[in-house]
Interface confidence: medium
């Protein structure tokens, strides 16, 4: 039979490659079937028999068409300060991300080892750079004519209201106070919120806090021995 209608296993024509979802087995010197996602090669092909595939066992997966002898292990179960954004199935690995308002402060290829709360900028300081999945919030002192009266990981410095008649001038942490006549603003009223970081499984880049940032009071775990949930196992 010509190669384009051949059934696996078959010997490819010289100089040609195997078809989609097939691989060339060096031992058999034949084009053989790959196993579908969620499966692995239980028995490799020979000159007379095709690949025998089997389903991945619990807590293992294959995401691609493959001919691996065993499925990949899903990553460690998520720690107490993470949320599982993708479950471990036969076709996909588990993905853990830091819970909202937290970021990954220490990671390895296996994923995030340590989540920490996003820094909150204190009154008089606003968010200069928002937190991401892998970097902390950077705060900056509010410039003249702007203020922030909140302790927040999302609020930026806002312009002082502009008064026809000024009662109390604003400073870095309080808005101006007007008398009698209606106030006007150079921006819409209300706090300006920056979006929360989008969950992406990116590698860790270490944040470099600037001298003007508010001190971090973040911590990961309670002081004292780790409860079993924090580690991947109990002792």
């Amino acid at each position: 039979l010509p190669a384009q209608v051949a059934f696996t296993p078959y010997a490819p024509e010289p100089g040609s490659t195997c078809r989609l979802r097939e691989y060339y087995d060096q031992t058999a010197q034949m084009c053989c079937s790959k196993c579908s996602p969620g499966q692995h090669a239980k028995v490799f092909c020979t000159k007379t028999s095709d690949t025998v595939c089997d389903s991945c066992e619990d807590s293992t997966y294959t995401q691609l068409w493959n001919w691996v002898p065993e499925c990949l292990s899903c990553g460690s179960r998520c720690s107490s300060d993470q949320v599982e954004t993708q479950a471990c199935t036969r076709e996909q690995n588990r993905i853990c991300t830091c819970r909202p308002g937290w970021y990954c402060a220490l990671s390895k290829q296996e994923g995030c080892r340590l989540c920490a709360p996003l820094r909150k900028c204190r009154p008089g300081f606003g968010v200069a750079r928002p937190g991401t999945e892998t970097s902390d919030v950077v705060c900056k002192a509010c410039a003249p004519g702007t203020f922030s009266d909140t302790t927040s990981s999302t609020d930026v410095c806002r312009p002082h209201r502009i008064c026809s008649i000024l009662a109390i001038p604003g400073n870095a942490s309080t808005d101006a106070v007007c008398t009698s006549t209606s106030p006007t603003r150079s921006m819409a009223p209300g706090a300006v919120h920056l979006p929360q970081p989008v969950s992406t499984r990116s590698q860790h880049t270490q944040p470099t806090p600037e001298p003007s940032t508010a001190p971090s009071t973040s911590f990961l775990l309670p002081m004292g021995p780790s409860p079993p949930a924090e580690g991947s196992t109990g002792d």
């Epitope: 292990s73 990553g75 402060a105 220490l106 390895k108 994923g111 775990l221 580690g231 991947s232 002792d235």
Partner: antibody, heavy 120, light 111 residues
């Protein structure tokens, strides 16, 4: 309870290789790192590297790249370290230790150690 | 690589007294309010044993006479009161970044 059982003492000739084993029990082997640490007689501790058995990913101290090769067998919950091209400088006790992916991020359980003596 | 310098190299303390061991890192081992510094005890002929993790957290099963403190580059292990069973060599170790490194060790003796 978590236990790490290491293989017995090795006497080897210069230029040869040895393969040390570390069998884990009492926890899910694929969930945590296995670290390897060297200690020469009367000396301090030196980190060789670590392996994440779940994926086989390895991390090495540059000093031990080419000297140590870390592997793991999930089916037997055993981690291995092969030391190649042995010299007298490799004579030491080698420890394996578990390091949790989350939480402590420290080596909280250790094997008893394997003594390697390189001598002609 | 982060270099850890322990002092003193050896220490003799009377039973019931306080022992203080210092560990200084060549650069900060802190990240986001966590210090990735740990302390181990090694009795001759035995493997090291984790005493304190992340600077100040007492490992399960370790007596409360052991405590750790410090941040960034300067860390301290305190044993108070010292007992006869505490004769050992003590090591600090950082896990902030690869390669993980250990201090040179402090040998504690009873005088």
């Amino acid at each position: 309870q978590v236990q790490l059982q290491q293989s017995g003492a090795e006497l080897a000739r210069p230029g040869t290789s040895v393969k040390l084993s570390c069998k884990a029990s009492g926890y899910t082997f694929t969930d945590d790192y296995i670290d390897w640490v060297k200690q020469r007689t009367g000396q301090g501790l030196e980190w060789i590297g670590e392996i994440y058995p779940g994926s086989g990913n390895t991390y090495y101290n540059e000093k031990f790249k080419g000297k140590a090769t870390l592997t793991a067998d999930k089916s037997s919950s055993t981690a291995y370290m092969q030391l190649s091209s042995l010299t007298s400088e490799d004579s030491a006790v080698y420890f394996c230790a578990r390091s949790q992916v989350y939480g402590k991020i420290a080596m909280d359980h250790w094997g008893q150690g394997t003594s390697v003596t390189v001598s002609s | 690589d982060i270099v850890l310098t322990q002092s003193p190299a050896s220490l003799a303390v009377s039973l019931g007294q306080r022992a203080t061991i210092s560990c200084r890192a060549s650069e900060s081992v802190d990240n986001s309010g966590n210090s990735f510094m740990h302390w181990y005890q090694q009795i001759p002929g035995q493997p090291p044993k984790l005493l304190i993790y992340r600077a100040s957290n007492l490992e399960s099963g370790i007596p409360a006479r052991f405590s750790g403190s410090g941040a960034r580059t300067d860390f301290t292990l305190t044993i108070d009161p010292v007992g006869a069973v505490d004769v050992a060599t003590y090591y600090c170790q950082q896990s902030k970044e690869d390669p993980y490194t250990f201090g040179g060790g402090t040998k504690l003796e009873i005088e």
